[in-house]
């Protein structure tokens, strides 16, 4: 039994880090493997993660962590019984994938303006709380070509757009994701999408 693709890990910079790797053949990850992780400092405890299958030869482990601080560094040991398959380290602050934003809502009651709001996925004391920027994806359910991305580079979790920039009388969906430039994070997963029917008063045209 060998590791084909070494574990790569990302942290939500709050409570979970997720490590994924591939074995050289079909593996029952939960029965055959254990990932031990330990914060590097005196008297820290070793924790054991039982991996789950992620495809035939793929494994994934969710590592529970206390509030992350930038200095945190973990040793990782992947075991198959008594055999050490791989040894590495992981610094959560250097491999951040933010949590996905939540509670995406489209407010259509403002005259001819769409207001999209969502929730910051971090509590106010978390470092990422004041460092997230967002991308909002809006697309038409009727027309696959009607697909647009709005970059929200300010901190407020909201976006205003004129309803007239979208077609009237059809349904649209929106979703949002986040990233933090300060930690050079990857993008978060997309939030669950929300749907609304876009309608607005067409301006009177004179011929």
């Amino acid at each position: 039994m060998k590791v084909l693709q070494e574990p790569t890990c990302v942290s939500d910079y709050m409570s979970i880090s997720t490590c994924e790797w591939d074995m050289n053949g079909p593996t029952n990850c939960s029965t055959e493997l254990r990932l031990l992780y330990q914060l590097v400092f005196l008297l820290s405890e070793a924790h054991t993660c039982i991996p789950e299958n992620n495809g035939g030869a793929g494994c994934v482990c969710h590592l529970l962590m206390d509030d992350v601080v930038s200095a945190d560094n973990y040793t990782l040991d992947l075991w198959a019984g008594q055999q050490l398959l791989w040894k590495g380290s992981f610094k959560p602050s250097e491999h951040v994938k933010p949590r996905a934003p939540g509670n995406l809502t489209v407010h259509t009651n403002v005259s001819d303006t769409l207001l999209l709001t969502w929730s910051n996925p971090y509590p106010p004391d978390n470092y990422l709380y004041n460092h997230l920027t967002y991308a909002v994806n809006i697309w038409s359910e009727n027309d696959p070509a009607d697909f647009r991305i709005y970059n929200v580079t300010y901190l407020e979790p909201s976006l205003r757009i004129a309803a007239s920039t979208l077609k009237s009388g059809i349904s649209y969906r929106a979703r949002v994701r986040a990233w933090a430039q300060c930690y050079n994070t990857t993008w978060s997963e997309w939030s669950p999408s929300t749907k609304w029917h876009n309608s607005y008063r067409e301006p009177f045209e004179q011929h």
């Epitope: 409570s15 979970i16 914060l39 400092f41 005196l42 008297l43 820290s44 405890e45 789950e52 969710h62 529970l64 962590m65 206390d66 509030d67 992350v68 601080v69 949590r99 996905a100 939540g102 509670n103 996925p121 509590p123 106010p124 004391d125 978390n126 997963e189 939030s191 669950p192």
Partner: antibody, heavy 115, light 107 residues
Framework: QVQLVESGGGLVQPGGSLRLSCVAS????????MNWVRQAPGKGLEWVSY????????YYADSVKGRFTISRDNAKNSLYLQMNSLRDEDTAVYYC????????WGQGTLVTVSS | DIQMTQSPSAMSASVGDRVTITCRAS??????LAWFQQKPGKVPTRLIY???SLQSGVPSRFSGSGSGTEFTLTISSLQPEDFATYYC?????????FGQGTKVEIK
């Protein structure tokens, strides 16, 4: 091994105050965020409060906000819960529980609020 | 605040039965969900975290699934020591909230 021992519970009248303590051993207390969780007699679990190891930030359940204060003394390996303006509905066993996500619990201390 | 609704609140089952408990969140919590077991007079112990990750030392007959708002705890073959009360917990945001509990009793 990890151990959490609560104390300070007892009988108190409505409107009164109590200070609960939780002494930790077997791990580096200053590196752990901590919680208080309570359980009224015959009822379910209710999270009460949290204090971060990283920032010292604190959070409270709506039911205790403004009345309870969580604090810690890393030099004494101790977690505290100052409970003021106690009500009948605060009667419960109070547990301290360690992060991440309540991996270790104390045995609890009983707080009875009654006239 | 996020509400966690567990069902059923109580159930009777026999040794060897497959038992399923569900937990519904009032809004999306991704996989930030844990399951705890509590026996009478004892302290709760964590069985599952991150919705589906088995806590080390917990028997493999326990499993968790779900994401978003719908979650399930399954005991594949109920054992005598599994008769207890089970709680779900969301830690996606503060205040953290538990489900009201499911008591699994002997039929």
């Amino acid at each position: 091994q990890v151990q959490l021992v609560e104390s300070g519970g007892g009988l108190v009248q409505p409107g009164g105050s109590l200070r609960l303590s939780c002494v930790a051993s077997g791990f580096t207390f200053s590196h752990s965020s901590m919680n208080w969780v309570r359980q009224a007699p015959g009822k379910g679990l209710e999270w009460v409060s949290y204090i971060s190891r990283a920032t010292g930030a604190v959070y409270y359940a709506d039911s205790v906000k403004g009345r309870f204060t969580i604090s810690r003394d890393n030099a004494k390996n101790s977690l505290y819960l100052q409970m003021n303006s106690l009500r009948d509905e605060d009667t419960a066993v109070y547990y301290c529980a360690r992060e991440p996500v309540f991996d270790y619990w104390g045995q609890g201390t009983l707080v009875t609020v009654s006239s | 605040d996020i509400q966690m609704t567990q069902s059923p609140s109580a159930m009777s089952a026999s040794v060897g039965d497959r038992v399923t408990i569900t937990c519904r969140a009032s809004q999306d919590i991704s996989n930030y969900l844990a399951w705890f077991q509590q026996k009478p007079g004892k302290v709760p112990t964590r069985l599952i975290y991150a919705a589906s990750s088995l806590q080390s030392g917990v028997p493999s007959r326990f499993s968790g699934s779900g994401s978003g708002t719908e979650f399930t705890l399954t005991i594949s073959s109920l054992q005598p020591e599994d008769f207890a009360t089970y709680y779900c917990l969301q830690w996606s945001s503060y205040p953290r909230t538990f489900g009201q509990g499911t008591k699994v009793e002997i039929k």
